[in-house]
């Protein structure tokens, strides 16, 4: 399998609303027209797929309607946003990029972005 370098930030802190954004950048060895991006979560040595999108170069990423991910693409960069995160979702989020067409097929897997999610403190009861 032809390998491709994928870069992503080491650490990202989710917002108080449970939203985390990071850039996934790949070093495209060829002129891909169709690219698949998959976000994987690794926690306790288990890897699960968070979301995936296939896009045509120059077009927007389209995730499934019920996906917790959204994203935009610009050249060889994909800006990914994951929403609805809670403290229990803290973990390593790995960006996997596949150049689907034209051949040859290339696969690149990033080292992962550690996303920290802190649940907001509930507002204290007020007498006012």
């Amino acid at each position: 399998c032809k390998a491709m370098h994928v870069a992503q930030p080491a650490v990202v802190l989710a917002s108080s609303r449970g939203i985390a954004s990071f850039v996934c950048e790949y070093a495209s060895p060829g002129k891909a027209t169709e690219v698949r991006v998959t976000v994987l979560r690794q926690a306790d040595s288990q890897v699960t797929e968070v979301c995936a999108a296939t896009y045509m170069m120059g077009n927007e990423l389209t995730f499934l309607d019920d996906s917790i991910c959204t994203g935009t693409s610009s050249g060889n960069q994909v800006n990914l946003t994951i929403q609805g995160l809670r403290a229990m979702d803290t973990g390593l989020y790995i960006c996997k990029v596949e150049l689907m067409y034209p051949p040859p097929y290339y696969l690149g897997i990033g080292n992962g972005t550690q996303i920290y999610v802190i649940d907001p403190e509930p507002c204290p009861d007020s007498d006012f």
Epitope: C1, K2, K31, T33, E34, T54, M56, E98, M100, Y101, P102, P103, P104, Y105, L107
Partner: antibody, heavy 123, light 107 residues
Framework: QVQLVQSGAEVKKPGASVKVSCKAS????????MHWVRQAPGQRLEWMGW????????NYAQNFQGGVTMTRDTSINTVYMELSSLKSDDTAVYYC????????????????WGQGTMVTVSS | AIQLTQSPSSVSASVGDRVTITCRAS??????LAWYQQKPGKAPKLLIY???SLQSGVPSRFSGSGSGTDFTLTISSLQPEDFATYYC?????????FGQGTKVEIK
């Protein structure tokens, strides 16, 4: 010359699996994706997916995900398409087709096709 | 997913006639369209790729045109061996869908 030769016709019972082979010759086997296309009696052609002979990577149409497995054996220049949990509406001719990509036109197509394998699913 | 609609579904024509088949995509696909010919009991044969590029070995009486959503396959002078079913296929994005086919019959 460049050709794709497929395995013979199959008759299967509902719920069974079938594995169709496609042997390539006359070109660099690992330089082209191999696609699978099916055609039910009197119906349009339906793209099922591709396998990359070089890496073994696959890309399946959503309709077939979970039911189809495409593999390859580079030692004998052969790709395989296995369809599981067969139903009567899987009765069709299954074709393998070589991917053709024109770098100047930046467009793909299927330039070489196998002769087709008829799969009949009947109880 | 992108869908393709061909028209007409069938056409009756005589040898020497000019035949035109159209293919409409449900969304823009640039020039990423191919045309195939299929005869009964046989595998399809590639005629045109990239909307208008003639595949090697295909007679020049076949031509393709169009871009975006509307495409045309033209047979300038129908020959006896051209009676068959013709399919368009979008190769813009997966899944690579085919049209429903146009059958060219002898009048």
């Amino acid at each position: 010359q460049v050709q794709l030769v497929q395995s013979g016709a199959e008759v299967k019972k509902p719920g069974a699996s079938v594995k169709v082979s496609c042997k390539a010759s006359g070109y660099a086997f690992d330089g082209h994706y191999m696609h699978w296309v099916r055609q039910a009696p009197g119906q349009r052609l339906e793209w099922m997916g591709w396998v990359d002979p070089h890496s073994g990577a696959t890309n399946y149409a959503q309709n077939f995900q979970g039911g189809v497995t495409m593999t390859r054996d580079t030692s004998i220049n052969t790709v395989y398409m296995e369809l599981s949990s067969l139903k009567s509406d899987d009765t069709a001719v299954y074709y393998c087709a070589r991917d053709f990509y024109d770098t100047s036109a930046k467009s793909g197509a299927f330039d070489i096709w196998g002769q087709g394998t008829m799969v009949t699913v009947s109880s | 997913a992108i869908q393709l609609t061909q028209s007409p579904s069938s056409v009756s024509a005589s040898v020497g006639d000019r035949v035109t088949i159209t293919c409409r995509a449900s969304q823009g696909i640039s020039s990423w369209l191919a045309w195939y010919q299929q005869k009964p009991g046989k595998a399809p044969k590639l005629l045109i790729y990239a909307a208008s590029s003639l595949q090697s070995g295909v007679p020049s009486r076949f031509s393709g045109s169009g871009s975006g959503t509307d495409f045309t396959l033209t047979i300038s002078s129908l020959q006896p061996e051209d009676f068959a079913t013709y399919y368009c296929q979008q190769v813009n994005s997966f899944p690579w869908a085919f049209g429903q086919g146009t059958k060219v019959e002898i009048k």
